[in-house]
């Protein structure tokens, strides 16, 4: 797995620790928590990523309406179970034995239940709503530059291809950025959808998680971005499945 | 303006190695990748590879892992391809450019010649 | 790869008249309603330079008697009224798949 050879760090991960006992003396690097090694020339997957975190210490409508299927993050951090390419495993549990589905992002698609809950597969999470609100401007971006610059980020940055960055949707103060990834695209070697989004929003709180990097410094035609509110809404290729308590909750 | 300043034209033996380099102005140089494009007249246009200015590694099609080798210097903002064990079939206009919102290649440099002759 | 088949290799067209060229893909080369396939112009001793990007728009800069159609695999670069100026070799090129890939090319001349 590659890295920065000079000086043996992960550019795309700082939660690993890297030495030089590779094949060849080649620098490896492990992620914190799971001690899975990983390639530092493209992103670290969540699963490992949220692992590593819960180990470290403690610190005119053009706009799209998220469907009635549409996930958000709610149950916050965990420390998840996951498999040995570092996808997150269908079933949860925490250590009182209460246990859920997740989608291939993390995210709780099921009631809690105990030991005996099922989880027959990892359902994927092929769409994701990335809402943003930024501060207040002199005025409203340009939205062909808004998307260009987007795009340029998440190729760049995360290496996500642009034909994953379904739309860049504009209504000042809101951007929507749409990243649709179905199986039957993604190619081995592809970012997922899921991994970048996730860079991107820990980017956006200012939690980087490339080693040695500032902050992201958006500009829009050298205009600041930046963003005051950020809400994910995720669509799994099936739709979850919830009690009708919580949905009338 | 957003400038790619190529270096120029190369006339070389076959077998040696040849470096030919692009500097980049008019833009913050990490923000984009630097891609080189191989034209000659048997095969039109082809992709060659990209260098990452932002991790620094690079990324070659199949036909030209051994053939390149590409580096970057932030420090003069500056991307060098390295030919090498040079045949006549390396002869060709070889070009910089830098990629747009959709991957097309809306930055060009000048083109730099190489003409391998013995 | 994805190969594009450019046709015809050259053209020759009267000034003032339409002149067509036609890019054929392997597979497809749409996403979410983005055709990822750009047209460039490109005169002696100068690099290529973007005409059309997304199948359909219109580079900043670029005259609108160029105009670009198609979806999926048959894409089509469009002159018309044919200029002088225009005399120049057209590429086609697909960015939905790693490697980029380019057409062969079409020589364009004034009759």
């Known amino acids: 797995h590659t890295a920065a050879q000079d000086n043996c760090t992960c550019p795309t991960n700082k939660m690993t620790v890297c030495s030089p006992d590779g094949p060849g003396g080649r620098c490896q690097c492990r992620a914190l928590g799971s001690g899975m090694a990983v390639d530092c020339s493209t992103l670290t997957s969540k699963c490992l990523l949220l692992k590593a975190r819960m180990s470290a210490p403690k610190n005119a409508r053009t706009l799209v309406r998220p469907s009635e299927h549409a996930l958000v993050d709610n149950d916050g951090l965990y420390d998840p179970d996951c498999d040995p390419e570092g996808r997150f495993k269908a079933r949860q549990c925490n250590q009182t034995s209460v246990c859920w589905c997740v989608n291939s992002v993390g995210v709780r698609r099921t009631d809690k239940g105990d030991l005996s809950l099922r989880c027959d597969e990892l359902v994927r999470t092929h769409h994701i709503l990335i809402d943003l609100r930024h501060r207040p401007t002199a005025g409203a971006f340009n939205h062909s530059d808004l998307d260009a610059e987007l795009r340029r980020l998440f190729r760049e940055r995360y290496r996500l291809h642009p034909k994953f960055v379904a739309a860049v949707h504009y209504e000042q103060p809101t951007i929507q950025i749409e990243l649709r990834q179905n199986t039957s695209q993604k190619a081995a070697g592809d970012v997922d959808i899921g991994d970048a989004a996730y860079y991107f929003e820990r980017d956006i709180k200012g939690e980087s998680l490339f080693q040695g990097r500032g902050g992201l410094d958006l500009r829009v035609r050298g205009e600041p971005l930046q963003v005051e509110r950020t809400l994910i809404y995720y669509l799994d290729e099936i739709p979850p499945k919830f009690s009708m308590k919580r949905l009338t909750a | 303006q957003v400038q790619l300043q190529q270096s120029g034209a190369e006339l070389v033996r076959p077998g040696v190695s040849v470096k030919i380099s692009c500097k980049g102005s008019?833009?913050?140089?990490?923000?984009?990748?630097i891609h080189w494009v191989k034209q000659s007249h048997a095969k039109s246009l082809e992709w060659i590879g990209l260098i990452s200015t932002y991790y620094g590694d690079a990324t070659y099609t199949q036909k030209f892992k051994g053939k390149a080798t590409m580096t970057v210097d932030k420090s003069s903002s500056t991307a060098y391809m390295e030919l090498a064990r040079l045949t006549s079939e390396d002869s060709a206009i070889y070009y910089c450019?830098?990629?747009?919102?959709?991957?097309?290649?809306?930055?060009w440099g000048q083109g730099t010649t190489l003409t391998v002759s013995s | 790869d994805i190969v594009l088949t450019q046709s015809p290799a050259s053209l020759a067209v009267s000034l003032g008249q339409r002149a067509t060229i036609s890019c054929r893909a392997s597979?497809?080369?749409?996403?979410?309603?983005?055709?990822?396939m750009h047209w460039y112009q490109q005169k002696p001793g100068q690099p290529p330079k973007l005409l059309v990007y997304?199948?359909?728009n219109l580079e900043s800069g670029i005259p609108a008697r160029f105009s670009g159609s198609g979806s999926r695999t048959d894409f089509t670069l469009t002159i018309n009224p044919v200029e002088a100026d225009d005399i120049a070799t057209y590429y086609c090129q697909q960015s939905y798949e790693d490697p980029p890939t380019f057409g062969g090319g079409t020589k364009l001349e004034i009759k």
């Open positions: 997304r199948a359909s």
């Open positions: 008019g833009y913050t140089f990490t923000d984009y990748s």
């Open positions: 597979e497809s080369v749409d996403s979410y309603g983005n055709s990822f």
């Open positions: 450019a830098l990629l747009g919102a959709y991957n097309y290649f809306d930055y």
